[in-house]
């Protein structure tokens, strides 16, 4: 599975994990069919994948939701896939919105973001919502992930 | 295009084919502007992608349908892409949920599906739908692919 | 970051970019948090991505909408992902639809388009939207990108 | 370590039902996957279904499409196979299995295997 010793391969895929906090950043798991190629890529605190590499990384999320438009806030569920690098700002790399459905009790929507971007060793990204309550954690909807290129 | 005799590139891209049968797995074909770099990554059937080599592969798909909540089922529409490995259960990889349109006659809607998994040799891939009449088979709306890291 | 002095890392990630043009193609701009791994990918009038080295790419888009059903036309938001080489008529690689929201002002969504495909020296990939007045510029929200296999 | 234990096996004519039943026990049933294989006489062990006892989302061979239904019941930790229109072709021994992960890569997952119940479809 490697490139060579002086450039393995680098990639995880992480499953989404139901969570009592009430923080807006999604939890993740290496569960079901999960991906972890070494400790390169490493999943910190059930919230970040951390790399160790610098370079050029894809870096994906999908999440699935279900909410009503009068259940909900006016604003729309928004999932952002953000950067934490040591020493600088967090950052948003990318967003994605959906405004929710009039369907009762609630509409489900899955919504994918993914793009290339340079990390710096000890970077890390992680994945926001707006509401976390209404995240989808059935088999399969809601994942995270990155390959290094 | 080669990486090198021993690690060749690995990547496809088929185009969806409406079918006449009544299961729930979508039919490919090679056609228009598809993608089959050689003989280690395989269209069999018309419905499932399988590759000959194990790695990490990164699978992706594109489902877009027409659907409208009068006229469908209270379940929303969902793709699915799953897996087939020789002596194993088959597997849900990934999921998208979307809920129906109450545009009339229907509304169009696109999931995108993706995500790194390992694959054995002999394993295939393969994409259900709840619906397969309401997917979309014009050009570009409908596609599924593969690329090995 | 290189492969190999014959064999460089080829990527791009570009940010989307409002637009007083009336045209269908959407402009990006090397801005914020973009990559332009070196100058075998060019951003060129802000409108296509091109590149010099023939070979596979994974190519993709997204696009995040805000639209109003009443105060649209009864077609449906599309996003296409579509290719110029030197020579040949322009194509649909990859294109997206959903239906317009009832939500009022108007209702997000957002589109993801991604796949597999052989392009030539000097071909180009743009995204061309049935009305560029909906895109939304926010951060994060309309990205373009590509890398080499 | 899993054990399973399955009944509801026997003779049936053409377009008849048979209900098969696994029972596990041995660990938290929703922290895994069950499902059915079956091995005809002569031939390899197939995939028949499986489902996903976290939230019993499913799939199936195409040969037993629309005709057999796997389902679970949590509380009694137990997976169920109801065939429906049974065809001579679907005579073979019914294994059910359950599928759990170790740590390390998502393939080391490992199999935990029933006895097997032979169902004949004759008339």
């Known amino acids: 599975m490697q490139k060579g010793d002086q450039n393995p391969q680098i990639a995880a895929h992480v499953i989404s994990e139901a969570s009592s906090k009430t923080t807006s950043v999604l939890q993740w798991a290496e569960k079901g069919y999960y991906t972890m190629s070494n400790n390169l890529v490493t999943l910190e605190n059930g919230k970040q994948l951390t790399v160790k590499r610098q370079g050029l990384y894809y870096i994906y999320a999908q999440v699935t939701f279900c909410s009503n438009r009068e259940a909900s806030s006016q604003a729309p569920f928004i999932a952002s896939l953000c950067l934490k690098s040591p020493g600088r700002f967090e950052r948003i790399l990318l967003r994605a919105a959906n405004t929710h459905s009039s369907a009762k009790p609630c509409g489900q929507q899955s919504i994918h973001l993914g793009g290339v971007f340079e990390l710096q060793p000890g970077a890390s990204v992680f994945v926001n919502v707006t509401d976390p309550s209404q995240v989808s954690h059935g088999t399969g909807f809601t994942s995270f992930g990155l390959l290094k290129l | 295009m080669q990486k090198g005799d021993q690690n060749p590139q690995i990547a496809a891209h088929v185009i969806s084919e409406a079918s006449s049968k009544t299961t729930s797995v979508l039919q490919w074909a090679e056609k228009g502007y598809y993608t089959m770099s050689n003989n280690l990554v395989t269209l069999e059937n018309g419905k499932q992608l399988t590759v000959k080599r194990q790695g990490l592969y990164y699978i992706y798909a594109q489902v877009t349908f027409c659907s409208n909540r009068e006229a469908s089922s209270q379940a929303p529409f969902i793709a699915s892409l799953c897996l087939k490995s020789p002596g194993r259960f088959e597997r849900i990889l990934l999921r998208a949920a979307n809920t129906h349109s109450s545009a009339k006659p229907c509304g169009q809607q696109s999931i995108h599906l993706g995500g790194v998994f390992e694959l054995q040799p002999g394993a295939s891939v393969f994409v259900n739908v709840t619906d397969p009449s309401q997917v979309s088979h014009g050009t570009g709306f409908t596609s599924f692919g593969l690329l090995k890291l | 970051m290189q492969k190999g002095d014959q064999n460089p890392q080829i990527a791009a990630h570009v940010i989307s970019e409002a637009s007083s043009k009336t045209t269908s193609v959407l402009q990006w701009a090397e801005k914020g948090y973009y990559t332009m791994s070196n100058n075998l990918v060019t951003l060129e009038n802000g409108k296509q991505l091109t590149v010099k080295r023939q070979g596979l790419y994974y190519i993709y888009a997204q696009v995040t909408f805000c639209s109003n059903r009443e105060a649209s036309s009864q077609a449906p938001f599309i996003a296409s992902l579509c290719l110029k080489s030197p020579g040949r008529f322009e194509r649909i690689l990859l294109r997206a639809a959903n239906t317009h929201s009832s939500a009022k002002p108007c209702g997000q969504q957002s589109i993801h388009l991604g796949g597999v495909f052989e392009l030539q020296p000097g071909a180009s990939v743009f995204v061309n939207v049935t009305d560029p007045s909906q895109v939304s510029h926010g951060t994060g929200f309309t990205s373009f990108g590509l890398l080499k296999l | 370590e899993v054990q399973l234990v399955e009944s509801g096996g026997g003779l049936v004519q053409p377009g008849g039902s048979l209900r098969l039943s696994c029972a596990a026990s041995?660990?938290?049933?929703?922290?895994?996957?069950m499902g059915w294989f079956r091995q005809a006489p002569g031939k390899e062990r197939e995939f028949v279904a499986v489902i996903y006892t976290s939230d019993g989302a499913n799939l199936y061979a195409d040969s037993v499409k629309g005709r057999f239904t796997i389902s679970a019941d949590n509380s009694k930790n137990t997976a169920y196979l109801q065939m429906n229109s049974l065809k001579p072709e679907d005579t073979a021994v019914y294994y059910c299995?359950?599928?759990?992960?170790?740590?390390?890569?998502?393939?080391?997952?490992?199999?935990?295997w029933g006895q097997g119940t032979l169902v004949t479809v004759s008339s």
């Open positions: 299995a359950a599928e759990t992960y170790g740590s390390g890569s998502s393939l080391m997952s490992e199999y935990d």
């Open positions: 041995g660990r938290s049933f929703s922290t895994y996957t």
